[in-house]
């Protein structure tokens, strides 16, 4: 079958990195600079992806494979194949229409990307707040108040938690 196909279509003999040049009697010509063909039998070469602006080259384009981009420091990839770069924010912030903004009280973000999420509501699980939440960290839930009643198994008392917004003396 392969031999038959070759007789019918001379282009099928053109390997990756070349294209079947109709202007030159269907001979296999190398892909021009800044282009590639990743499979054999191609009638054209594809233009290489260019990593520009906030995109930087992770892998150079070759005659047989496209360039790959990632993002410059301060940005992270979004989308398939890093089709977008999104600005990092600091922990305790989220990216809004007006740039990076601090998380509102009662929310936190412990990463440089993503949105601020509400603190865990310990009382929903019948627990108490062991450590207060901050813009960067979720609250830590402790044992339920019932577990701390006299006669319950001894629990080492936690260090007093600082109120959010209060700096140490």
């Amino acid at each position: 079958f392969e031999r038959t196909r070759s007789l019918q279509d001379p282009c099928s003999n053109c390997p990756a990195g070349t294209f079947c040049d109709n202007n030159r009697n269907q001979i296999c010509s190398p892909c021009p600079p800044n282009s590639f063909s990743s499979a054999g039998g191609q009638r054209t070469c594809d233009i290489c992806r260019q990593c520009k602006g906030v995109f930087r080259t992770r892998k150079e384009c070759s005659s047989t494979s496209n360039a790959e981009c990632d993002c410059t420091p301060g940005f992270h990839c979004l989308g398939a194949g890093c089709s977008m770069c999104e600005q990092d924010c600091k922990q305790g912030q989220e990216l809004t229409k007006k740039g990076c903004k601090d998380c509102c009280f009662g929310t936190f973000n412990d990463q440089k990307r993503g949105i601020c999420r509400p603190w865990t509501n310990c009382s929903l699980d019948g627990k108490s707040v062991l450590v207060n939440g901050t813009k960067e960290r979720d609250v830590v839930c402790g044992p339920s108040p019932a577990d701390l009643s006299p006669g319950a198994s001894s629990v080492t008392p936690p260090a007093p938690a600082r109120e959010p917004g209060h700096s140490p003396q």
Epitope: R49, V54, F55, C82, S83, M84, E86, Q87, K97, G99
Partner: nanobody
């Protein structure tokens, strides 16, 4: 061929002003959202300001009240008026076509200029 060419950079004293221009060609400028971004020496890129085709504008907090982004669709030009300049504004400033319409987010198909250097120093 798409081209974005920035001009107007230079050396200016703290408190001074500069007006950057960006001449666009090769795409439909009037219907494109545009942005200015900058890269300080040894630092990463920072989005500075954006303007929609409608004229609506957005600014990063650090330049709000000091910088003004504007456009002239008849001249296919984008501008950045920079007043009350500070040493920390020193950077290469880039003009870019901004496809995502999401502040701080850039798309691989966005167009970028080569940049113009702004140095704020006494």
């Amino acid at each position: 061929e798409v081209q974005l060419v920035e001009s107007g950079g230079g050396l200016v004293q703290p408190g001074g002003s500069l007006r950057l221009s960006c001449a666009a060609s090769g795409f439909t400028f009037s219907s494109s959202a545009m942005s200015w971004a900058r890269q300080a020496p040894g630092k990463g890129f920072e989005w500075v300001a954006s303007i929609y085709s409608s004229g609506k504008t957005y600014y990063v907090e650090s330049v709000k009240g000091r910088f003004t982004i504007s456009r002239d669709n008849a001249k296919n030009s984008l501008y950045l008026q920079m007043n009350s300049l500070r040493a920390e504004d020193t950077a290469v400033y880039y003009c870019a076509r901004w496809k995502t319409l999401r502040v701080g987010v850039w798309d691989e198909s966005d167009y970028w200029g080569q940049g113009t250097l702004v140095t704020v120093s006494s």
